[in-house]
């Protein structure tokens, strides 16, 4: 998980950071770009049907450290990544859904998505 804001020197952060926004654009955004004093983020989560939906946008500086920490929420599969190193840096983020815990299998028979390596076809 990238939390580049934690390792980037404060002076390297632009005063105003422009981020790609999708499903999470403020009304005054233009061309799917928002501005913030904090972080850009990209988040993936599952809707009620099990469909993965990606949202991206801006997080204000206040409280964003906590939001970017991606604390697990029981019974909710989601993942968030944040960045600050350059404008629109969140278009390069690629959060992936966390693996299912055993108890989640009550929701149905699931085939795991294997990222970045060969996947044996069932």
């Amino acid at each position: 998980k990238k939390e580049d804001g934690e390792s980037t020197a404060p002076t390297a952060r632009p005063k105003v950071l422009r981020c790609k926004c999708h499903h999470h654009c403020p009304e005054d955004s233009v061309n799917n770009i928002c501005s913030t004093d904090g972080y850009c983020f990209t988040m993936i989560e599952e809707d009620d049907s099990g469909t993965p939906v990606v949202t991206s946008g801006c997080l204000g500086l206040e409280g964003s450290d906590f939001q970017c920490r991606d604390t697990p929420i029981p019974h909710q599969r989601r993942s968030i990544e944040c960045c600050t190193e350059r404008n629109e840096c969140n278009k390069d983020l690629h959060p992936t859904l966390p693996p299912l815990k055993d108890r989640d299998f009550v929701d149905g028979p699931i085939h795991h998505k294997h990222h970045h390596h060969h996947h044996h076809h069932h």
Partner: antibody
């Protein structure tokens, strides 16, 4: 042999309703999702949404919310696409396509159903 | 939504040629890209999934590669039966989007 066999071509008038079926065989129906993909004449492929064959919960792409409905008859291993209040721009071939739950590539495709909307 | 920019739109090649099709994504997809073949009058057929994995029964002349935003599909030695339209698809996030297609014609 895994197959998705769809119902035959449909000729409809604007404002009418069509219901397309997709009969699955050769695998356990409820362990895969069923997607619907639209292909207008001479055009590319557009994902309309899917229905979770285990839970029965559908999800629709934004362009297909409202007049479109996915449903299942699990006991018959059949998925359905219903389009209400048909418009000229609904003229297309509609494919059902199977996907593993939580994977989103489509490994088996239906035979396709051509819907023509014309007054 | 994620835009898949596929090039070229048309390819006119001779049997035995090597063919390369590219897809560029508007955002990072990791390896969540599939490639399909659609022959005239037929349904699409899965060839490649997870960017580089060949699906069951697909000849090894078909290969895929790439990660992030840039993906490539290659037919190492084109055969007459490869006449078709080829599509890429991102399978990372809803709505799952396809490239506009590449029509492969054989001289």
């Amino acid at each position: 042999q895994i197959q998705l066999v769809q119902s035959g071509p449909e000729l409809k008038k604007p404002g009418e309703t069509v219901k397309i079926s997709c009969k699955a065989s050769g695998y356990t129906f409820t362990t895969y999702g069923m997607n619907w993909v639209k292909q207008a004449p001479g055009k590319g492929l557009k994902w309309m949404g899917w229905i979770n064959s285990y839970s029965g919960v559908p999800a629709y792409a934004d362009d297909f919310k409202g007049r479109f409905a996915f449903s299942l008859e699990t006991f018959a291993s059949t998925a359905y696409l219903q389009i209400n209040n048909l418009r000229d721009e609904d003229t297309a071939t509609y494919f059902c396509a199977r996907s593993e739950l939580r994977n989103w590539y489509f490994d088996v495709w239906g035979t396709g159903t051509t819907v023509t909307v014309s007054s | 939504s994620f835009v898949m920019t596929q090039t070229p739109k048309f390819l006119l090649v001779s049997a035995g040629d090597r063919v390369t099709i590219t897809c560029k994504a508007s955002q990072n997809l990791g390896n969540d890209v599939a490639w399909y073949q659609q022959k005239p009058g037929q349904s699409p057929r899965l060839l490649i999934y997870f960017a580089s994995n060949r699906y069951t029964g697909v000849p090894d002349r078909f290969t895929g590669s790439g990660y992030g935003t840039d993906f490539t599909f290659t037919i190492s030695t084109v055969q007459a039966e490869d006449l078709a339209v080829y599509f890429c698809q991102q399978d990372y996030s809803s709505p799952f989007t396809f490239g506009s297609g590449t029509k492969l014609e054989i001289k």
